[in-house]
Interface confidence: low
């Protein structure tokens, strides 16, 4: 397993609708044809997988149907969007990139993006 540099923004603020977007960029040492991107959430020293996608270079990045993530890829950049976030989801979101094929296998883990989520104030009932 060879190391690879992964860059991502330090801080992102989710929108009032609970959507956060950030770019995960990796320094590809070779011409990978298959890449796997995983988003991990670290909170209270516990790391959990948020979502993952495997994609072929030049093709659309497709997360699984059950995923709260969507994304697009462009060269060595992956534009990630996480939706349905609530205040309790605030935490450090780490981008992990694996160059799956062809060999050799490369692994890169970013320093993480701190995503802050603020729940919107509830609107009072209205007749309109």
């Amino acid at each position: 397993c060879k190391a690879m540099h992964v860059a991502q923004p330090a801080v992102v603020l989710a929108s009032s609708r609970g959507i956060a977007s950030f770019v995960c960029e990796y320094a590809s040492p070779g011409k990978a044809t298959e890449v796997r991107v995983t988003v991990l959430r670290q909170a209270d020293s516990q790391v959990t997988e948020v979502c993952a996608a495997t994609y072929m270079m030049g093709n659309e990045l497709t997360f699984l149907d059950d995923s709260i993530c969507t994304g697009t890829s462009s060269g060595n950049q992956v534009n990630l969007t996480i939706q349905g976030l609530r205040a309790m989801d605030t935490g450090l979101y780490i981008c992990k990139v694996e160059l799956m094929y062809p060999p050799p296998y490369y692994l890169g883990i970013g320093n993480g993006t701190q995503i802050y989520v603020i729940d919107p104030e509830p609107c009072p009932d209205s007749d309109f």
Epitope: T54, M56, D66
Partner: antibody, heavy 120, light 106 residues
Framework: EVQLVQSGAELKKPGASVKMSCKAS????????MDWVRQAHGKGLEWIGN????????SYNQKFKGRATLTVDKSSSTAYMELRSLRSDDTAVYYC?????????????WGQGTLVTVSS | EIVLTQSPATLSLSPGERATLSCSAS?????MHWFQQKPGKAPKLWIY???ILASGVPARFSGSGSGTDYTLTISRLEPEDFATYYC?????????FGQGTKLEIK
């Protein structure tokens, strides 16, 4: 009516390869990924991988990477799976099954299965 | 990969009884999906997105759970319900299935 019709049973020797087909009808072939799942006799279900018929991009279970190849022929709405370097423990029924999307349930449609027997 | 563990492996009950099948994931999943399979047949989607019954599935079936623990419940067993049930996760690749729970007539 959505239908997935798979090719017939195969008997192969260890070390050989097998290529099976899955012909889709009743929907737009390129709108849904096709997955492949296998089941050894009396055992559970094991996901092999899937293919996007439109882009032909694939995702594989690492267990089968390098041995399984998924392809499609869009003109005939047919998906194929080739498995190489067959071993006796590859003896199983191989199913194709259709992915869903946000509006259609995943794996709601399955082929009837292709029995592959690996024996010397 | 996410490992799904189903319990019990075999459940022996009589028609009319209540059945509870469990599926535990090695890490949190968004939804759990369930398939029914009878001998010599392809699996059938039975419950998807944790609690949605697939087309044609009787209302005596229900699904629940979140995080790592999920349950398929049959409120009152009918003879046609005796089969093997598999749980499946699609939260991350590789997609994985549980080893199955065989529901047999006591």
């Amino acid at each position: 009516e959505v239908q997935l019709v798979q090719s017939g049973a195969e008997l192969k020797k260890p070390g050989a390869s097998v290529k099976m087909s899955c012909k889709a009808s009743g929907y737009t072939f390129t709108d849904y990924n096709m997955d492949w799942v296998r089941q050894a006799h009396g055992k559970g279900l094991e996901w092999i991988g899937n293919i996007n018929p439109n882009s032909e991009s694939t995702s594989y279970n690492q267990k089968f990477k390098g041995r399984a190849t998924l392809t499609v022929d869009k003109s005939s709405s047919t998906a194929y799976m080739e498995l190489r370097s067959l071993r006796s423990d590859d003896t199983a029924v191989y199913y194709c099954t259709r992915d869903g999307n946000r509006y259609d349930a995943w794996f709601a449609y399955w082929g009837q299965g292709t029995l592959v027997t690996v024996s010397s | 990969e996410i490992v799904l563990t189903q319990s019990p492996a075999t459940l022996s009950l009589s028609p009319g009884e209540r059945a509870t099948l469990s599926c535990s994931a090695s890490s949190s999943v968004t939804y759990m999906h369930w398939f029914q399979q009878k001998p010599g047949k392809a699996p059938k989607l039975w419950i998807y997105s944790t609690s949605i019954l697939a087309s044609g599935v009787p209302a005596r079936f229900s699904g629940s759970g979140s995080g790592t623990d999920y349950t398929l419940t049959i409120s009152r067993l009918e003879p046609e319900d005796f089969a093997t049930y598999y749980c499946q996760q699609r939260t991350s690749y590789p997609l994985t299935f549980g080893q199955g729970t065989k529901l047999e007539i006591k």
